[in-house]
């Protein structure tokens, strides 16, 4: 059998000779040189070397347990006479004993890390982690003690796990913002004659909530012109908060004073301001000076911080309202006159009004915009405003009249206002009825009497009040004789009837009838209107199969009578 | 006596796993390097697997790479075969055998039969 | 891998006669080749190692040679327990392959 134990040599050997491993041995060598001891495997015959006849193993370099800890070989044993081996070849360790030859080494360089400002002592920060190539399950020359070299009394290290900790209570980011930490992580479980490294961790405190906002001044005055129409900018505010991002944002609120209708506060996000803007028409003459008390406060807030005050603050706003030279103010927005059509040239219809809405009460003068008065129907008093007629009027014609009257201040013209005014025109009874269309008909020959051949419908371009009632009638010099008569309806129609029983259209082939139509109105007016009859041959059933006259084309709807 | 001996062989269904054991005596079993050949009805031994006296080298037969494991307990001086996935390809007579020097087998044991079979 | 080719598959002779067994390799092995003699129902014996070599209680009759890839068993003086079948095996590399074997038997 083969007598070794397991074969140890310890690195990093520096003596000038070769490092004596151990001696390959197998009970059947009787020291005689009759057995050939073989090496092979792992840096066989360059870094180890066999003493063929001894069986002695020496290592020719300096070895590095960090690069290989073990080295794995096979001996063999061979009778040099016969060449037969005497041992089994049989694999072999050389195990690499560990110096500490290595400090321990942080995963990084530099590591960064972020904490809450105000944190609570002993709130976790970031882990180092330093490594040791040498061996751990070998003495202490890999176990690794960190320790704060820099950043106390800020922070701690927790000296076996390498977790840094906040270590003071109220660590304010806008007091100091930055810290460098140096961590030593030292081998030998810290001890005297451990090597050591070093890591630097640049921790940034992150802003937390615990500053109210806070106006750098307690009263802030602007001023508006009272033209200023709503939504217009007369000013901003700024509070200022020592935190960032989040907890720097500011809502501007309105929460007290006069000009709590009349103004409203619009936060600019980007700018962190307080925009006053109009919120209602400004009046100088009412009112001349504003107060408004505005306040800053952080949307969001930190419970935990609430007892340091109300994160918010209070500022006076004084606004004063600037006079502007205003234009003349019409006592209504639009005026409504009536005027008779039959009014005489000069006819006063009525007057409008304009004062000067400032304090200096500017007299104004009245004209007539003329785009909207072509025909110059109108006037109007350039001193008192009263409008008046200055061309005789037909409703028929038209029956609103739609101007504008100016104001304009004498003293500074460019001062001016407008006001439409819309005058209606009255009716007066001056047109006669007359009939709806020309009436042209006919009779047959064998008409009976009392039979109607035509309706008759009258118009009137007047328009009473109480509607039109007209009145029909055959006129006096055809009333006598006539071979047809009227028959007024009562509702502003009448009929034509035969009068007689027969009619020969050899004897008579056309007859006209003057009928009178008069309206009820006042004055009454009247007109006369002719109705062609044509006598014609008939069938049976009363159809017109021919006249004397061309062929009559008669309305659609027309009752001619059977 | 130098004596090699096989257990745990038996009948196994295709797919199926099974571990065969043997037990060295007579020698000093962590000074040598050990070996499973297997030989099937009517033909020639053939080589399976190889493990070194401390087990830094271990080789397989083509054949049974990825299916069976070869490994040793020194303290217990005994070697284990463990095969799985199973083929019908896979009967025959295991023979444990001791390796003298680079692989040439100087001492077998009698023997432990597999046999594969649904 | 290498391929190990074994001639004649079996022979007979006589107690008394000298037999020669041949294999031969694919490539060459630079003798580590062995011998191994398996009697039916047993299992393979060592008779021979690195080509030459006699294992421990082989008997003198038994003698290998040969080289590079052709190598011989030889049995001298033939003796009836010599019936049974004759393996050579390759161990230069793995992996490890065997011949297809030699039937010996008595005439």
């Known amino acids: 059998s083969w007598m070794w134990n397991q074969f140890f040599l310890l690195e990093e050997y520096t003596g000038s000779d070769y490092q004596y491993v151990g001696k390959l041995h197998s009970d059947q060598d009787r020291g005689d040189g009759s057995l050939k001891y073989i090496l092979s495997g792992d840096g066989a015959g360059d870094l180890f070397i066999i003493n063929e006849n001894t069986g002695d193993i020496q290592a020719t370099k300096r070895l590095d347990r960090e690069e290989k800890p073990v080295y794995i070989l096979r001996a063999q044993a061979i009778n040099r006479r016969t060449g037969r081996p005497v041992e089994p070849e049989s694999e072999f360790i050389i195990k690499i004993h560990d110096i500490n030859d290595n400090e321990p080494i942080f995963t990084k360089e530099v590591y960064t890390a972020t904490v809450p400002e105000m944190s609570d002592v002993g709130t976790f920060v970031v882990q180092v982690t330093a490594t040791d190539a040498d061996d751990p399950t070998y003495g202490n020359s890999a176990k690794v003690v960190y320790s704060i070299l820099q950043g106390q009394p800020y922070f701690s290290v927790e000296s076996e796990t390498g977790i840094i900790k906040t270590a003071l209570l109220n660590m304010d980011r806008e007091n100091r913002e930055q810290y460098q930490v140096v961590i030593q992580a030292k081998d030998m479980g810290g001890q005297m004659g451990g090597l050591s490294g070093t890591t630097t961790v640049n921790i940034t405190l992150t802003d937390v909530n615990d500053n109210p906002p806070r106006f750098p001044q307690s009263t802030y005055q602007f001023k508006t012109p009272e033209s200023s129409p709503p939504g217009t900018p007369i000013g901003r505010i700024k509070a200022s908060d020592a935190d960032v991002g989040e907890n720097a944002e500011i809502e501007y609120s309105i929460t007290d004073g006069e000009g709590l209708d009349m103004f409203d506060v619009i936060t600019d996000q980007e700018t962190q301001e307080g925009i006053i803007t109009v919120k209602k028409l400004l009046d100088f003459e009412k009112k001349k000076v504003y107060t408004l008390k505005v306040e800053a406060s952080n949307p969001y807030v930190e419970p935990r911080f609430l007892y340091l005050g109300p994160f918010k603050d209070s500022a006076t706003v004084r606004i004063v309202v600037e006079d502007v030279d205003e234009p003349p103010v019409f006592s209504k927005l639009a005026y409504i006159l009536q005027i008779r059509e039959d009014a005489q040239i000069n006819t006063t219809i009525g007057s409008v009004t304009a004062q000067d809405p400032d304090a200096a009460r500017n007299p104004v003068k009245y004209s007539v915009d003329r785009h909207t008065d072509m025909d110059r129907i109108f006037n109007i008093d350039s001193g008192n405003g009263s409008i008046f007629t200055s061309k005789l009027l037909d409703r028929e014609t038209l029956l609103w009249h739609n101007i504008t009257v100016i104001a304009t201040e004498i003293n500074n013209p460019k001062q001016s206002s407008r006001v439409p005014l819309y005058i209606k025109v009255l009716d007066v009874n001056d047109n006669a009825p007359e009939f709806a269309e020309f009436y042209e008909t006919f009779v047959c020959e064998k008409a009976k009497a009392d039979q109607l051949i035509q309706t008759l419908h009258a118009v009137d371009k007047d328009d009473p009040y109480s509607g039109h009632q007209f009145s029909f009638s055959l006129a006096p010099e055809a009333a006598s004789g006539s071979n047809f008569t009227i028959q007024d309806n009562k509702d502003n129609t009448a009929g034509i009837l035969t009068r007689k029983n027969g009619y020969n259209r050899h004897e008579m082939s056309t007859y006209l009838l003057p009928v009178v139509i008069s309206d009820n109105d006042y004055p009454v007016q009247s007109s006369t209107g002719t109705v062609t009859v044509r006598v014609c041959a008939c069938d049976h059933h009363g159809n017109m199969q021919s006249c004397h006259a061309e062929a009559l084309i008669h309305p659609t709807g027309l009752s001619t009578g059977a | 006596e130098v004596k090699l001996v096989e257990s745990g062989g038996g009948l196994v269904k295709p797919g199926g796993s099974l571990k065969v054991s043997c037990a060295a005596s007579g020698f000093t079993f962590s000074d040598h390097g050990m070996a499973w050949v297997r030989q099937a009805p009517g033909k020639g031994p053939e080589w399976v697997a190889f493990?070194?006296?401390?087990?830094?080298?271990?080789y397989y037969a083509d054949t049974v790479t990825g299916r069976f494991t070869i490994s040793r307990e020194n303290a217990k001086n005994t070697l284990y075969l463990e095969m799985s996935s199973l083929r019908s390809e896979d009967t025959a007579m295991y023979y444990c055998a001791r390796v003298y020097v680079k692989w040439y087998f100087d001492v077998w044991g009698a023997g432990t039969t597999v046999t594969v079979s649904s | 891998d290498i391929q190990m080719t074994q001639s004649p598959a079996s022979l007979s002779a006589s107690v008394g006669e000298t037999v020669t067994i041949t294999c031969r390799a694919s490539?060459?092995?630079?003798?580590?080749l062995a011998w191994y003699q398996q009697k039916q129902g047993k299992s393979p014996q060592l008779l021979v190692f690195?080509?030459?070599l006699l294992a421990d209680g082989v008997p003198s009759r038994f003698s290998g040679s040969g080289s590079g890839t052709q190598y011989s068993l030889k049995i001298n003086s033939l003796q009836s327990e010599d019936v049974a079948r004759y393996y050579c095996q390759h161990y230069y590399s793995t992996p490890l392959t065997f011949g297809a074997g030699t039937k010996l038997e008595l005439k």
């Open positions: 690195a080509a030459t």
């Open positions: 490539e060459n092995i630079d003798s580590y």
């Open positions: 493990i070194s006296n401390l087990a830094y080298s271990i």
